[in-house]
C-alpha cells in the first residue's frame, strides 16, 4: 500500500491561521493512523480519521506548531511514515505610513513606515518610494535574536516640493519566505502627498478710508496666499500689546464708530502649517454731542414710588452733569453720574417733586440743557367694598365703596353697579386748596332679594387725568352677591313607618329649604329634655331597632340666616315576654289569709294584662289593678288555677299558677279539681 500527504512535504503557515495536514493511503481498506512531531512534543492540534484519510487540524497556528509532523499509517503488519515540515511566519497587516507633521514645501519631514507583528523579521525588507523613486530600502538582518512578533519600522527624512503634490508615498514590505508561491509575502501601503504652503503675501484693502468720523462705518477686506487657502482672522491690537479677536471672515465691517475704535487692526492668514499677518491703522475723529432725557419730556409719577430721570450724552467721551428745578427749589433727590449717563432718583416721590427738572451737560467748552416735567398722581389700590352685615333676603344692608389715598381728588368719580344697573354715582368736583392724599367713599343702602344671588356688585373708581401718561386710570373691585335665605319648610319622611316592630330598620330623611343649602343635624330628645346629636346626614338610618330606640327624634336645618326644626316620634313595639305570675306570700296559704296574685310584663309598656281563674264551668276574668288581684280572707273555693295573659298589637304571652288553700279544721288541704 502507499501513503500520501497534503501538502506533500512543507507547509508555510501564518500565525493565527487554521492549518490542516492530511494523510491518506491507497491499497489499504482500513488503515490505522497516528501523528507525532519529530521531537515528540505535543501535537497542539486535533486529529480526525475518516476511512483512508486522517487530518490534523491546528487552529490557531502558533509557535507550538513549528515542527516536522510525522504521519504513520499501519496496514495489518506493515507500517509507512511520511513527514510534513510546518514552518511559521507572521505578516498579518499592510504597513502603515506616518508623517511627523503636515508636508510643507521647503521644510524637512520624517516619514515612518511600520510593519506590525512580523516574524521572522530577519527575513523582512522594507522599501519606501516616492512615486517611482526609491527613497530608502532596509533589511532587518541583525535584529532577530529570538522568535517573537515585533513591529519593524523604516524612517526617511525628505524635503517636499510643490511638484510632489499628487505623488504617492509607497511603503512596500517583503517577507523573504517565498519558496511557496501561494503565500502573500509582499504587502504595501500607499499615501497620497498633500503638500502645503504657509500663508504669505497678506494684503488689506480699506473702504472708504483709514481716517473716519465718529458714527461712520468702514469695511476692511483681507486676502492671503497659501495652500490650503488660508483662513482669515481679524483682531485689534490692545494698549498692552495683546490681540483682541474680532472676526473669522475675510471682510470686517465696523459701524457707528467711536473714538475708541481708533487703533491698529491686524489681519492674519492662517492654514494648517503657518500664519502671516498684515496691520492697518484706523483713526476715528470726534463728532458734535447730543443730550437725551428719559423717560421723555413729561412723566406721570405715583406718589410714594421711585422715579429715575436719566440724562444721556452721545458724542462726548467725558461729559459733566448738573441738575436743577426750573424754579430753583431744592432737588429732593439723589444724583448719580457715570460715564455718559447721569440719573436723578426721586424716592419716594412726594408733592415737593412736582416740578420741571433740568439737566445741564458740559462737554469741553460746549453746554446743552434738556428738561422734563414731573406730574403727580396717587391711585395706588383698587376700591374696597364693605357691607354692614351678611346679605339676608329682605333685610336692608349698607354698602360702602372706599377709594384710598387719591390725588388729585377733584378728578375722582366713584360708581356702584349691581349687575348692569347703576345704583349710585358720585364725582368729587369740589376745589381743594391743599395738596394731600385723601380717602373717599360712596355709601348706599339697599334691600337684597333672592334674585340678586350671583349678580356682581361692582365699585368703579375713575381718575379723569387723560393728559397724564400712566396706568391704570380706572380701578374696580367686584363682589359676587350671595343672598342668604333662612331654612324653612323642614319636613321629615319616615320609611316604612314611625311605628315599628322591634328588629326592623327605619330611614328618616330630613328636607329643608334655604340658601345657602341648610346643613342637616339629627338629634334625639333625652328623657331630661336635652338633645343628643346623632348625625349630620340628611338621612338617619336605624338598623335592627330595639325598644329603647323609641322616642322623639329631631331634625334641624341650619344656615347663616337661621334655623328650622321638625320632630318625629318613633315607636318600637315588642311582643310581651318575661311575664312573671306570682302569689304573695305563697302559692300555698291557709283559709282566711290574704293573697295577692300579681302579673307583670318586664319588657313592654302598653300591654293589656288579663287575669283569669280557670274552672270547668268557664274562666272568670278577675279585676286587676296594674296586673295585681288581691284575695282577702281566702276561702277554700279560691283554690285553683290562675292564668295571666299579657297582650299587645304585636303578640301575647300566657303564664299560670296553682293556688292551694288549706282548711283550718282537720288540717285538710283543698286543691282545685284540675
Amino acid at each position: 500500500f502507499k501513503i500520501e500527504t497534503t501538502p506533500e512535504s512543507r507547509y508555510l503557515a501564518q500565525i493565527g491561521d487554521s492549518v490542516s495536514l492530511t494523510c491518506s493511503t491507497t491499497g489499504c481498506e482500513s488503515p490505522f493512523f497516528s501523528w507525532r512531531t519529530q521531537i515528540d512534543s505535543p501535537l497542539n492540534g486535533k486529529v480526525t480519521n475518516e476511512g483512508t484519510t486522517s487530518t490534523l487540524t491546528m487552529n490557531p497556528v502558533s509557535f507550538g506548531n513549528e515542527h516536522s509532523y510525522l504521519c504513520t499509517a499501519t496496514c495489518e503488519s506493515r507500517k509507512l511514515e511520511k513527514g510534513i515540515q510546518v514552518e511559521i511566519y507572521s505578516f498579518p497587516k499592510d504597513p502603515e505610513i506616518h508623517l511627523s507633521g503636515p508636508l510643507e514645501a521647503g521644510k524637512p519631514i520624517t516619514v515612518k513606515c511600520s510593519v506590525a507583528d512580523v516574524y521572522p523579521f530577519d527575513r523582512l525588507e522594507i522599501d519606501l518610494l516616492k512615486g517611482d523613486h526609491l527613497m530608502k530600502s532596509q533589511e532587518f538582518l541583525e535584529d532577530a535574536d529570538r522568535k517573537s512578533l515585533e513591529t519593524k519600522s523604516l524612517e526617511v527624512t525628505f524635503t517636499p516640493v510643490i511638484e510632489d503634490i499628487g505623488k504617492v508615498l509607497v511603503c512596500r514590505a517583503k517577507l523573504h519566505i517565498d519558496e511557496m508561491d501561494s503565500v502573500p509575502t509582499v504587502r504595501q501601503a500607499v499615501k497620497e502627498l498633500q503638500v502645503y504652503i504657509s500663508p504669505k503675501n497678506t494684503v488689506i484693502s480699506v473702504n472708504p478710508s483709514t481716517k473716519l468720523q465718529e458714527g461712520g462705518s468702514v469695511t476692511m477686506t483681507c486676502s492671503s496666499e497659501g495652500l490650503p487657502a488660508p483662513e482669515i482672522f481679524w483682531s485689534k491690537k490692545l494698549d498692552n500689546g495683546n490681540l483682541q479677536h474680532l472676526s473669522g471672515n475675510a471682510t470686517l465691517t465696523l459701524i457707528a464708530m467711536r473714538m475708541e475704535d481708533s487703533g491698529i487692526y491686524v489681519c492674519e492668514g492662517v492654514n494648517l502649517i503657518g500664519k502671516n499677518r498684515k496691520e492697518v491703522e484706523l483713526i476715528v475723529q470726534e463728532k458734535p454731542f447730543t443730550v437725551e432725557i428719559s423717560p421723555g419730556p413729561r412723566i406721570a409719577a405715583q406718589i410714594g414710588d421711585s422715579v429715575m430721570l436719566t440724562c444721556s450724552v452721545m458724542g462726548c467721551e467725558s461729559p459733566s452733569f448738573s441738575w436743577r428745578t426750573q424754579i430753583d427749589s431744592p432737588l429732593s433727590g439723589k444724583v448719580r453720574s457715570e460715564g455718559t449717563n447721569s440719573t436723578l432718583t426721586l424716592s419716594p416721590v412726594s408733592f415737593e417733586n412736582e416740578h420741571s427738572y433740568l439737566c445741564t451737560v458740559t462737554c469741553g467748552h460746549k453746554k446743552l440743557e434738556k428738561g422734563i416735567q414731573v406730574e403727580l398722581y396717587s391711585f395706588p389700590r383698587d376700591p374696597e367694598i364693605e357691607m354692614s352685615g351678611g346679605l339676608v333676603n329682605g333685610s336692608s344692608v349698607t354698602v360702602s365703596c372706599k377709594v384710598p389715598s387719591v390725588y388729585p381728588l377733584d378728578r375722582l368719580e366713584i360708581e356702584l353697579l349691581k349687575g348692569e344697573t347703576i345704583l349710585e354715582n358720585i364725582e368729587f368736583l369740589e376745589d381743594t386748596d391743599m395738596k394731600s392724599l385723601e380717602n373717599k367713599s360712596l355709601e348706599m343702602t339697599f334691600i337684597p332679594t333672592i334674585e340678586d344671588t350671583g349678580k356682581a356688585l361692582v365699585c368703579q373708581a375713575k381718575l379723569h387725568i387723560d393728559d397724564m401718561e400712566f396706568e391704570p386710570k380706572q380701578r374696580q373691585s367686584t363682589q359676587t352677591l350671595y343672598v342668604n335665605v333662612a331654612p324653612r319648610d323642614t319636613t321629615v319622611l319616615v320609611s316604612p313607618s314611625s311605628i315599628l316592630e322591634e328588629g326592623s330598620s327605619v330611614n328618616m330623611t330630613c328636607l329643608s329649604q334655604g340658601f345657602p343649602a341648610p346643613k342637616i343635624l339629627w338629634s334625639r330628645q333625652l328623657p331630661n329634655g336635652e338633645l343628643q346629636p346623632l348625625s349630620e346626614n340628611a338621612t338617619l338610618t336605624l338598623i335592627s331597632t330595639k325598644m329603647e330606640d323609641s322616642g322623639v327624634y329631631l331634625c334641624e336645618g341650619i344656615n347663616q340666616a337661621g334655623r328650622s326644626r321638625k320632630e318625629v316620634e318613633l315607636i318600637i313595639q315588642v311582643t310581651p315576654k318575661d311575664i312573671k305570675l306570682t302569689a304573695f306570700p305563697s302559692e300555698s296559704v291557709k283559709e282566711g289569709d290574704t293573697v295577692i296574685i300579681s302579673c307583670t310584663c318586664g319588657n313592654v309598656p302598653e300591654t293589656w294584662i288579663i287575669l283569669k281563674k280557670k274552672a270547668e264551668t268557664g274562666d272568670t276574668v278577675l279585676k286587676s289593678i296594674d296586673g295585681a288581684y288581691t284575695i282577702r280572707k281566702a276561702q277554700l273555693k279560691d283554690a285553683g288555677v290562675y292564668e295571666c295573659e299579657s297582650k299587645n298589637k304585636v303578640g301575647s304571652q300566657l303564664r299560670s299558677l296553682t293556688l292551694d288553700v288549706q282548711g283550718r279544721e282537720n288540717n285538710k288541704d283543698y286543691f282545685s279539681p284540675e
Partner: antibody
C-alpha cells in the same frame, strides 16, 4: 534610560487572583514583543507568557494556559499579567522582559494558605 | 518540551583561571529558517538575570570578550577565559527554537 518596572506582587491564597503590571520606559514599547518569566524559590527559571508588539497574539506554556492572561496598553507603555486559580507552585519572582535582552527587577508572588 | 541540561551544577574557580559550562538540549536547536536560538544568562546575587550571549555565540553589548559561546545542534558551551570576581552567580542557558521556550537548571559559579 531603558528600564522595566514591575509591581502588583503579593501574598495570595490558593485559588485566588492577582494582576501584575510592568511599566516600560526609554524605548519604543509598541515595537517589541514582551514576556513574563518567573523564578521559583529553588531558582528555576520558567517562561510563562509572551505577547506580540500590537497585542494581537499571545503565547503561553501548558502550565499556565487558561489561568494566566498577558495583555498590554501601548498608549500607557504598560504590560500586564492577570493570574487566576493560583496554586502553590505559582509562588515565584515574576520578571517582565523585552525579549530576553532586557529584564525588570521582578515582583514577588507568594501563594499560600 | 525541550529539556535543557546544564553541567556542572556548581563550578568553583580561582580568579584568573578559565571556566567552562556545558548545556545539552534534548533536541536539535537548529530551526527551519537556519537559526539556532540559544542564549546564555548570568544572574548575579540579588539581581535579575542578564543576557550575555544570544544566537549561540553573539555577545550582548557591554559584555566582556572573555565570555565566548559555541556549539551547534544539541551541544553548547559557555567559556570564560579568565574568571573575575564579578563573574560569580548563576549561569543559565535558554532555547527559543522549540515552543515552549525553556531554560536550563542553572550552574553556580563560585570563586575559590
Amino acid at each position: 534610560e531603558v528600564q522595566l518596572v514591575e509591581s502588583g506582587g503579593a501574598l495570595v491564597k490558593p485559588g485566588g487572583s492577582l494582576k501584575l503590571s510592568c511599566v516600560a520606559s526609554g524605548f519604543t514599547f509598541s515595537s517589541y514583543a514582551m514576556s513574563w518569566v518567573r523564578q521559583s524559590p529553588e531558582k528555576k527559571l520558567e517562561w510563562v507568557a509572551e505577547i506580540s508588539s500590537t497585542g494581537s497574539y499571545t503565547h503561553y506554556p501548558d502550565t499556565v494556559t487558561g489561568r494566566f492572561t498577558i495583555s498590554r496598553d501601548n498608549a500607557k507603555n504598560t504590560l500586564y499579567l492577570e493570574m487566576s486559580s493560583l496554586r502553590s507552585e505559582d509562588t515565584a519572582m515574576y520578571y517582565c522582559a523585552r525579549g530576553e535582552a532586557l529584564w525588570g527587577q521582578g515582583t514577588s508572588v507568594t501563594v499560600s494558605s | 518540551d525541550v529539556v535543557m541540561t546544564q553541567t556542572p551544577l556548581t563550578l568553583s574557580v580561582t580568579v584568573g583561571q578559565p571556566a567552562s559550562i556545558s548545556c545539552k538540549s534534548s533536541h536539535s536547536l537548529l530551526d527551519s529558517y537556519g537559526k539556532t536560538y540559544l542564549n546564555w544568562f548570568l544572574q548575579r546575587p540579588g539581581q535579575s538575570p542578564k543576557r550575555l550571549i544570544y544566537l549561540v555565540s553573539k555577545l550582548d553589548s557591554g559584555v566582556p570578550d572573555r565570555f565566548t559561546g559555541s556549539g551547534s545542534g544539541t551541544d553548547f558551551t559557555l567559556k570564560i577565559s579568565r574568571v573575575e570576581a564579578e563573574d560569580l552567580g548563576l549561569y543559565y542557558c535558554w532555547q527559543g527554537t522549540h515552543f515552549p521556550w525553556t531554560f536550563g537548571g542553572g550552574t553556580k559559579l563560585e570563586i575559590k
